[in-house]
């Protein structure tokens, strides 16, 4: 019997120092470019090799970025979010949400209090 896939969601504060070629990652998402259905959040789509984010090692492709230097990224147009990163200065603080896929036992053995669906 196949196991059910669940997700463990954690948050982390990541402080990056802008390198010679910038922060070194790509984003997708925004109110005009929803990457996840019914979610206009901003997601990391690419970590560039040898960039600041890659060298730090904590930011991962697929992470959702909740805020930049304390500024919430909710309900932003995609380009406005891009501009926010580009104008964020030398020291950049990111609040990110990691979503780790976990195998959670056989189907039909849902733990008590487990969210359905």
């Amino acid at each position: 019997m196949n196991g059910r896939v669940d997700y463990l969601v954690t948050e982390e504060e990541i402080n990056l120092t802008r390198g010679p070629s910038g922060l070194g990652f790509n984003i997708v998402g925004g109110t005009d470019q929803q990457y996840v259905s019914n979610d206009s959040g901003i997601y990391v789509s690419r970590i560039k090799e040898n960039g600041a984010a890659a060298l730090d090692g904590r930011l991962q492709e697929g992470d959702k970025i909740l805020s930049v230097n304390g500024q919430d990224l909710k309900n932003l147009l995609h380009q406005d979010a891009v501009d926010l990163f580009r104008n964020a200065g030398y020291a950049v603080s990111l609040r990110v949400q990691h979503r780790l896929q976990v195998q959670n036992g056989p189907i039909g053995h849902r733990g008590e209090g487990d969210p359905s669906g």
Partner: nanobody, 128 residues
Amino acid sequence: QVQLVESGGGLVQAGGSLRLSCAASGRPFSSLDMGWFRQRPGKERDVVATINWTGDSTYYLDSVKGRFTISRDNAKNTVFLQMNSLKPEDTAVYYCAARGGGSSVDSEYDVREFEYDYWGQGTQVTVS
């Protein structure tokens, strides 16, 4: 990590057609820019065609325009290269490549158009 597996290569006569496929796994396909590259005998690896993550922007090498078509099927996690009117000079190992799409948070000058992060093993195409 992204795993890429190409298929569809083979031996074909000049003027014939082949359809290459590249199946991707390891992360959501819908956020990936995809590309096809080729390495001809004794030559550097060249970009042949690319398609961005949303599917609304494509690029073709001049010598394949009008003959080759790149497309993607996000439901099947697959990118295709339809090759028509093949010529002997199309003989090469064809590689599928992928990278995360979207916008760089850095200045646009930093974008390297044909820099890809993940590569398949390649499939041989021989046109006789």
